[in-house]
């Protein structure tokens, strides 16, 4: 996988009035990295490893950069000529990547009320937009506004590609190995269900990065998606992740079912415990 830096900025307007606060989240290599609070923007490392990468003395620069981007986005939202009543959001997502062969990719995406309406390849400067008439209207509004502000266009939007890559390289050079791998702890539990069925749940926790395969197999063959229920892959607050998958099986057939886990090239299978380990809360209620 390439190294990546992802900025997610969101600004809001209420009844046509753009709010002064904004929210910025930064992900480094897919890991939550920085967070700018809505009302006061202070770059906050998410967990010890992010602190190691940034170092205290760089927080001011992060804060300054993110605050500037937030102001730009607020101005952009103010110029969107859409219905003004109620709550509206404008979101800008910027992503840059450095691949193993040293090639780079950068892109920028705008969302209005959660709907994508404009994208730009920051390397080729090529703009794309969805086919819907609403998206096209919004896209024209924003592009016209960006063209009007030639200085901003030059210094901000066209420089974003280089800035993002520069920041990413700076983080990668910091000496902290972001490509660390923390294997998951996997445990399987069972809970009584009804009519001779039991629910078996396989939980994986404490793993990094977040990409994981977790599924139930019967006789070595994957069960179909609609016979399994998955939990989201969620941060556990320690810079690692957790998730689960559950399925319902016939009591007495436990030995035929295994939980398959694959993470960062490693894999393992986990049987259903034979004893009656009761779990009061079932994911299948």
């Amino acid at each position: 996988e390439p190294h990546s830096l992802r900025y997610n900025l969101t600004v809001l307007s209420w009844d046509g009035s753009v709010q002064s606060g904004f929210l910025t989240e930064v992900h480094l290599d897919g890991q939550p990295f920085l967070r700018c609070d809505r009302q006061k923007c202070r770059a906050k490392p998410q967990g010890q490893w992010a602190e190691d990468v940034l170092g205290n003395k760089t927080w001011d620069r992060e804060t300054r950069d993110l605050t500037g981007n937030g102001k730009d986005l607020r101005m952009t939202l103010a110029h969107i000529k859409d219905q003004k009543e109620g709550l509206h959001s404008l979101q800008e997502i910027r992503v840059c990547e450095i691949h193993e062969d040293n090639s780079t990719r950068s892109s920028q995406h705008f969302y209005y009320d959660g709907e994508l309406f404009l994208s730009q390849n920051l390397e080729t400067k090529e703009w794309t937009m969805p086919q819907s008439s609403r998206a096209q209207t919004l896209a024209m509004n924003v592009r016209n506004f960006l063209k009007e502000d030639a200085m901003k266009t030059k210094t901000h939007y066209h420089a974003m590609h280089a800035d993002c890559l520069q920041e990413l390289r700076r983080y990668l050079k910091s000496g902290v190995v972001l490509r660390r791998t923390v294997p998951p702890m996997v445990n399987v539990t069972r809970s009584e269900a009804s009519e001779g069925n039991i629910t078996v749940t396989c939980r994986a926790s404490g793993f990094y990065p977040w990409n994981i395969t977790l599924s139930w197999r019967q006789d070595g063959v994957s069960l179909s998606h609609d016979t399994q229920q998955w939990g989201d892959v969620l941060p556990d607050g320690n810079g690692t992740y957790q998730t689960w998958v559950a399925t319902r099986i016939c009591q007495g057939e436990e030995q035929r079912f295994t939980c398959y886990m694959e993470h960062s090239g490693n894999h393992s299978t986990h049987p259903v415990p034979s004893g009656k380990v009761l779990v009061l809360q079932s994911h299948w209620q």
């Epitope: 197999r217 019967q218 006789d219 070595g220 063959v221 994957s222 069960l223 179909s224 016979t227 016939c250 057939e253 030995q255 035929r256 398959y260 694959e262 090239g265 894999h267 299978t269 049987p271």
Partner: antibody
Framework: EVQLVESGGGLVQSGGSLRLSCVAS????????MNWVRQAPGKGLEWISY????????YYADSVKGRFTISRDNAKKSLYLQMNSLRDEDTAVYYC???????????????WGQGTTVTVSS | DIQMTQSPSSLSASVGDRVTITCRAS??????LNWYQQKPGKAPKLLIY???SLQSGVPSRFSGSGSGTDFTLTISSLQPEDFATYYC????????FGGGTKVDIK
């Protein structure tokens, strides 16, 4: 003796239908997931469909999706393959095969039928 | 779909030879790989499951190895009854067979 016996093969016109059956003996069919695998003349094996022991999970190969339907009747110890809109390229020997339930298995087929021949002519 | 590529597609060998057949998956399939033997006019027979586990009743001269994308079936000392076609099969993502390797007499 543990065995699977297929039937229902034969000559059919292109666009026609055929229903294959596979009867199990010597073991409890309801405990096992089952498959249909075919082999065109002079060619390799092609897996075409899978059905889990309680019919809750069914898979098809892309080549037959939307045309073939796998089903089972555990009480009758039978597995079925309903084949519609048959094409020339469906000409093959069709095998039913049982998925092993040995601990640590990986979707392997431990018991196979002798096969039934389906010939589709245009 | 995951593609399974076997090599060679055919090979000639003599009784007593050590024979190696390889199977490569188009993406990682962990150890969800099985090997079968098929003789003309007969149904296939399971030899190896889970990449390296010998099926009950199969002679110990057959062995399997590998994990991820590259797998090997080895016959340590080829016997007359081993001349047949061998297939690999994955079950990591639904099920697919390799194209087969025909082992005939040199």
């Amino acid at each position: 003796e543990v065995q699977l016996v297929e039937s229902g093969g034969g000559l059919v016109q292109s666009g026609g239908s055929l229903r294959l059956s596979c009867v199990a003996s010597g073991f409890t069919l309801s405990r096992y997931s089952m498959n249909w695998v075919r082999q065109a003349p002079g060619k390799g094996l092609e897996w075409i469909s899978y059905i889990s022991s309680r019919s809750s999970t069914i898979y098809y190969a892309d080549s037959v999706k939307g045309r073939f339907t796998i089903s089972r009747d555990n009480a009758k110890k039978s597995l079925y393959l309903q084949m519609n809109s048959l094409r020339d390229e469906d000409t093959a020997v069709y095998y039913c095969a049982r998925v092993s339930d040995i601990t640590g298995n990986t979707g392997s087929f431990d018991i196979w039928g002798q096969g039934t021949t389906v010939t589709v002519s245009s | 779909d995951i593609q399974m590529t076997q090599s060679p597609s055919s090979l000639s060998a003599s009784v007593g030879d050590r024979v190696t057949i390889t199977c490569r998956a188009s993406q990682s399939i962990s150890s969800y790989l099985n090997w079968y033997q098929q003789k003309p006019g007969k149904a296939p027979k399971l030899l190896i499951y889970a990449a390296s586990s010998l099926q009950s009743g199969v002679p110990s001269r057959f062995s399997g190895s590998g994990s991820g994308t590259d797998f090997t079936l080895t016959i340590s000392s080829l016997q007359p009854e081993d001349f047949a076609t061998y297939y690999c099969q994955q079950s990591y993502s639904t099920l697919t067979f390799g194209g087969g390797t025909k082992v005939d007499i040199k």
